[in-house]
């Protein structure tokens, strides 16, 4: 957890992905209870979910969320307009595409409406919190007698994503994996025609448009080899 207390002089360490600050209180009370941490993820830059663990509250509390963008034209405080709920208690907020500004510092504030002094603010770099959709339309081309090429599509700008390809045969106990850059193409130079291969791919918003750590879900697997169609030996796009 990268955290720091924000100081009035503005000299916070802006290299951290987010910062946490709590309002000071004069006496020990409910106000001193820390608020849960807010976690935000931007899904394919289509919407963003900011969620917190509502069960960490000592009693069921409908915490409220406000947000704004620091030092920008979008610095007006906004109320959450679409809450997410867990057992009828607020546990998150969903923001739509037009409310997402990847390259401005996103400030999110959680507050206990019954104790307005009890609030916590975090600053997030949204370009580091993007999770793309899983790769789609995996296809295999046989380039030569022993060489396969795997291609896939992403529903996002190609150069913003890097990829991880995993493959194995039915004889393997574990996956072999290979990193692939924005060109979203993978070649396997030596294929054993007697074995059945399985391939899958996942993608990450890194490093050209952001520095996200989280990968997408895995694609549907695609298979090639002894048990696949013999109709067209040069093109296979069979999903499990």
């Amino acid at each position: 957890l990268n955290t720091t207390i924000l100081t009035p002089n503005g000299n916070e360490d802006t290299t951290a992905d987010f910062f946490l600050t709590t309002m000071p209180t004069d006496s020990l009370s409910v106000s001193t209870l820390p608020l849960p941490e807010v976690q935000c993820f931007v899904f394919n830059v289509e919407y963003m979910n900011c969620t917190w663990n509502s069960s960490s509250e000592p009693q069921p509390t409908n915490l409220t969320l406000h947000y704004w963008y620091k030092n920008s034209d979008n610095d007006k405080v906004q109320k959450c307009s679409h809450y997410l709920f867990s057992e009828e208690i607020t546990s998150g907020c969903q923001l739509q595409k037009k409310e997402i500004h990847l390259y401005q510092t996103f400030v999110v504030q959680l507050q206990d409406p019954r104790e307005p002094r009890r609030q916590a603010t975090q600053m997030l770099k949204l370009q580091n919190l993007v999770i793309p959709w899983a790769p789609e339309n995996l296809t295999l081309h046989k380039l030569s007698e022993s060489q396969l090429e795997l291609n896939w599509n992403n529903r996002f700008l190609n150069h913003c994503l890097e990829h991880l390809v995993q493959y194995r045969t039915d004889w393997d106990h574990s996956w072999t994996e290979q990193s692939v850059d924005y060109r979203h193409k993978f070649s396997l130079p030596s294929v054993d025609g007697q074995k059945r291969y399985t391939f899958r791919v996942r993608s990450r918003f890194n490093p050209l448009c952001g520095s996200a750590q989280h990968w997408s879900e895995w694609s549907h697997p695609i298979h090639w080899g002894s048990n696949t169609s013999k109709e067209n030996p040069f093109l296979f796009a069979l999903e499990a």
Epitope: L102, Y103, Q127, R155, L157, Y182
Partner: nanobody, 125 residues
Framework: QVQLQESGGGSVQAGGSLRLSCTAS????????MGWYRQAPGNECELVST???????YYADSVKGRFTISQDNAKNTVYLQMNSLKPEDTAVYYC???????????????????WGQGTQVTVSS
């Protein structure tokens, strides 16, 4: 499948004009920042002009007053009108797409081969 297809390049005399077009598909065009880069032989990829989703534009100092960037959201197309062309404008021109807000708030150097094949512009004296 994300695709950017440039067209409109060609050979022209110094002082002439060309209009480059770039048609985009496979992503939300009107929610992206678009740009034009160029690369002359032996040179690095150079940012020429950008247009953000809010309509704001940027021009490299070397093309200010001569080049104009525009876009047509209905056609998913971005244009670069190039007037008063000079021999030093000779290069392969590449169309680029970035996440919304990239150019105004983030930046970072780009390689020209991140996008399409480009279109050749040759200006002779």
């Amino acid at each position: 499948q994300v695709q950017l297809q440039e067209s409109g390049g060609g050979s022209v005399q110094a002082g002439g004009s060309l209009r480059l077009s770039c048609t985009a598909s496979g992503f939300t065009f009107d929610d992206s920042d678009m740009g034009w880069y160029r690369q002359a032989p032996g040179n690095e990829c150079e940012l020429v002009s950008t247009i953000s989703s809010d309509g704001s534009t940027y021009y490299a100092d070397s093309v200010k007053g001569r080049f104009t960037i525009s876009q047509d959201n209905a056609k998913n197309t971005v244009y670069l009108q190039m007037n008063s062309l000079k021999p030093e404008d000779t290069a392969v021109y590449y169309c680029a797409a970035e996440p919304r807000g990239y150019y105004s708030n983030y930046g970072g150097r780009r390689e020209c081969n991140y996008w399409g094949q480009g279109t050749q512009v040759t200006v002779s004296s």
